[in-house]
């Protein structure tokens, strides 16, 4: 007799989830010599242990602590790039500027990037049919709690100047409800972080407006200033040229406006 299964509003666990996590772990530890000591089977066991047999609306940060411990990693605290609603460009940037790091350039972020997962209460099964949606079902679901946990730790580790890429094409350039707005902003440590610099990425080629004057950016500035961290903002008018010139600043198109 088929068991009744809870139907959630969100998509189910990514297919081949265990294999994907394990394969990513192996790949990451091969590429990053400083993480070669990591035992990927133990990482998978800790990951699995965080959500298997648990109600997918009852996950806590505590559930992920064994995984956090295994995935402990030191990145240069003054080379952190946060992002909100503009992941692809942030990742393209750190692929070129190799000494800068987004969360997804760390082991734990790399393992989980773009994946969905959840289990079921009291069974060892992974739910491939549906998982809780943050809005429609519950916020304490396995994926949301994971990202909240790793994002908090990543922000807490930051020092000196922290950069954040924001999407200037969105109606809310800074969104208080995003992971950046709700978690990372509030976990930057004022005793370590001197400045948060926002890079507002323009969408339209002919868009020459100063988006640093946007009301939501002013709201971000206010939040940051109240936390005794300086705020700075710059427009990235031409993201294509920006990336090209990071890659090759001596290229003729970077030493001329033409």
């Amino acid at each position: 007799v088929p068991r009744w299964r809870q139907q959630w509003s969100g998509p189910g666990t990514t297919k081949r989830f265990p294999e994907t996590v394990l394969a990513r772990c192996v790949k990451y530890t091969e590429i990053h010599p400083e993480m070669r000591h990591v035992d990927c089977q133990s990482v998978w066991d800790a990951f699995k242990g965080a959500f298997i047999s648990k109600h997918p609306c009852n996950i806590t940060e505590e559930d992920y602590q064994p995984l956090m411990k295994l995935g402990t990693q030191t990145v240069p605290c003054n080379k952190i790039l946060l992002w909100s609603r503009i992941k692809d460009l942030a990742h393209q940037f750190t692929q070129v500027q190799r000494d800068m790091f987004t969360l997804e350039d760390t082991l734990l972020g790399y393992l989980a990037d773009d994946l969905t997962w959840c289990g079921e209460f009291n069974t060892s099964k992974i739910n491939y049919q549906s998982c809780p949606d943050w809005r429609k079902d519950c916020s304490n679901n396995p994926v949301s709690v994971f990202w909240k946990t790793v994002s908090r730790r990543f922000a807490e580790a930051a020092c000196d100047v922290v950069h954040v890429m924001l999407n200037g094409s969105r109606s809310k350039i800074f969104d208080k409800n995003s992971t950046f707005g709700s978690v990372e902003v509030h976990n930057l440590q004022p005793e370590k972080v001197q400045t948060l610099e926002a890079w507002v990425i323009h969408g339209g080629r002919e868009d020459s407006r100063d988006l640093c004057q946007d009301p939501t950016i002013k709201e971000l500035e206010s939040i940051i200033s109240k936390r005794n961290i300086q705020f700075s903002c710059k427009n990235i008018y031409r993201p294509d040229k920006f990336l090209q010139c990071v890659k090759n600043p001596e290229d003729s198109s970077c030493t001329s406006e033409i």
Epitope: Y237, C245, T255
Partner: antibody, heavy 121, light 107 residues
Amino acid sequence: QVQLVQSGAEVKKPGSSVKVSCKASGGVFSYYTISWVRQAPGQGLEWMGRIIPSLGATHYAQKFQGRVTITADESTSTAYMELSSLRSEDTAVYYCARSDSFYYAYYMDLWGQGTLVTVSS
Amino acid sequence: EIVMTQSPATLSVSPGERATLSCRASQSVSSNLAWYQQKPGQAPRLLIYGASTRATGIPARFSGSGSGTEFTLTISSLQSEDFAVYYCQQYNNWPWTFGQGTKVEIK
């Protein structure tokens, strides 16, 4: 607010070198362009070269190529301009200036207070 | 390199009057032109960039126009604090180059 604070006045002998510093206080330094511009007494402004601190990329005006070296230390948010083989015509006020960008619209929106370098035997 | 030529070298104007300063580039610099103000003993200050956009905190009496090779800086009603030397600068091609400056003095 961000300020560019330059080192003090220098008196140098012909043939020697001078190194002027420019510290970005209270602000961000890395993904900007720091330029050096000089102004001889009673004369106009002359752009010497630039550095993008985060990328370590420099670009010099032909006139100063081989004689000027621009460097930056990201950890202290400080840029340096070293001019060698000094002659009397190098007597000038040397300014550092920041451009908000390193790839587009290179106008200089923030200037240091200037450093007077006098070359005299 | 691109040569920037400013005219006149000196402009004598009474307070409250309009001042028009010209800057010509030896080849097109598109709209990649800035204007700076410099007072004696001080560093230059950015007034206009992109040929016509006022920098932060610059009063509305300052306006810039032009593109290509011909540019104009207009000060609609001169105040006492506006008497200074004004420089144009192109940032279209390396090396960046400045005009020789226009001194705006009290008539």
